[in-house]
């Protein structure tokens, strides 16, 4: 089923630090914090502070915006490649309006909007341009070679006219949080399994450490019990079968866990945590990905 929009309390959507998941069609009680079965794995790299944890931040770049509305000033960040992420609960879409733009299109400056069913490069006629994402998250990347140049954006959110989510899908934002697999009542639809989306700040990576129990034995066919973890950006997928402690690291700032129908029917369980990691190697801010026509 398509489910109903999730209603995340304002303070959860905008607050710093860890988040708990709310299913797309469930009541808020589901998202109450649950105790962990074990401590997370030793964290090989330091935890990155979430942008909301810094009371003063010198640059817009690298921030994750979770409030219902806000202004993002990407003018003059001093970085050739500046990225921000906007996240809202499942069942909402992100709206964007360009208030000011001083991008030099002839010099190769560009604004890139990236998200599910969204890939758009723009530069010309940006002023007062409005845009709506297809789903609840959006990454905005700005390529600007000139100091002081850039865009000023206003973003908002609204209920999605259509949803791509299943009734039991869940969303997590922020630099760290607790992961608990859904436990479904017989009335809840789980056709195709349930998904958990994790979005952190741009340029960060995601580490997941969790314990899977009661997984059952089936690994093939329609009733297979498995967990898939996908790196949303790089299309990399890792499959986990059977009871185990799993550890996984992403390449990008967006990940997705899928709990199969067989996993749910077996009343299997997964509990753990995710946190953010730095890139393995510091990125040179010289993106090559800006080639191509506008509007593609």
């Amino acid at each position: 089923g398509q489910g109903t929009p999730s209603l995340v309390p304002h303070e959860e959507a905008a607050a710093p630090g860890r988040t708990t998941a709310t299913p797309a069609g469930a009541s808020l009680e589901w998202s109450q914090a649950r105790g962990l079965l074990f401590s997370p794995a030793p964290q090989p790299r330091r935890l990155l502070p979430g942008p909301q944890e810094n009371s003063v931040q010198s640059s817009a770049c690298g921030r994750q915006h979770l409030e219902p509305t806000g202004t993002i000033d990407m003018r003059g960040p001093g970085q050739a490649d500046c990225a921000v992420a906007i996240g809202r609960p499942l069942g909402e879409v992100v709206t964007l309006r360009v208030l000011e733009s001083s991008l030099n299109c002839s010099a190769g400056d560009m604004l890139l909007l990236w998200g599910r069913l969204t890939w758009r490069k723009m530069c010309r006629k940006l002023l007062d341009m409005t845009f709506s994402s297809k789903t609840n998250t959006l990454v905005v990347r700005q390529r600007c070679g000139r100091p002081g140049g850039g865009v000023l954006l206003r973003y908002g959110s609204q209920l999605a006219p259509e949803t791509f989510y299943r009734e039991c899908d869940m969303q997590l934002f922020g630099p760290w949080g607790e992961i608990v697999s859904p436990s479904l009542s017989p009335a809840t639809s789980n056709a195709g399994g349930c998904r958990l989306f994790i979005n952190v700040a741009p340029h960060a990576r995601i580490a997941i450490h969790a314990l899977a129990t009661n997984m059952g034995a089936g690994t093939e066919g329609a009733n297979a019990s498995y967990i898939l973890i996908r790196d949303t950006h790089s299309l990399r997928t890792t499959a986990f079968h059977g009871q185990q402690v799993l550890y996984w690291e992403s390449e990008s700032s967006q990940a997705e866990m899928e709990f199969s129908e067989g996993f749910l029917k077996a009343q299997a369980s997964l509990r753990g945590q995710y946190w953010t990691l730095q890139s393995w190697v510091p990125e040179m801010q010289d993106p090559q990905s800006w080639k191509g026509k506008e509007g593609t």
Epitope: W119, L235, R236, A239, W280, M284, P287, Q288
Partner: antibody, heavy 117, light 110 residues
Amino acid sequence: QVQLQESGGGVVQPGRSLRLSCTDSGFTFSRYAMHWVRQAPGKGLEWVAGISYDGSYEYYADSVKGRFTISRDNSKNTLYVQMNSLRGEDTAVYYCARDLRGGEDYWGQGTLVTVSS
Amino acid sequence: ELVVTQPPSVSAAPGQKVTISCSGSTSNIGNNYVSWYQQFPGTAPKLLIYDNNKRPSGIPDRFSGSKSGTSATLGITGLQTGDEADYYCGTWDSSLSAVVFGGGTKVTVL
């Protein structure tokens, strides 16, 4: 056991179009990202395009951007690539590959596309 | 122009060890996982290594992978005549938003 079977290759004139298909005989098609990779005669592997498990993300090599379109139909366990404005340099064996960069990686046996007048 | 480079060929006697390097940048190998593929003439490539150093089931432990900084290495110990093939590294390039392959390395058993 996963079996990927490409079809639709053949000889086509420059500037014309061709659509390749790749059918998965297994249960797991809809779980994984799918890719097209090509190999020109005597040359190395070149990634062409990739698509997420649910079709919501598509990526393309610069060499085919704007000319090729990747798509999938999970109800039919089938992956497609629509190739327009074909050029001589598109001549290659085209492979479809599942989960190209993960441990559940599978490749088809390939279909030959020859672009020639 | 390839953004990930490999030596065109390497060779060694049976039973010896060969290593194949794969060199890239921070936007590909440096910050993404590397896979290695083996291809015999006229056949589809086969996955040997994924996530830098993991072997799929059925791949012998003579094959190993490692990564350091912006370079990756495939090692083959106890070289056999049946290992004569082309070997490719592959990774994701975050700047290009694309999978990139090295140009391939031909392994010859002397």
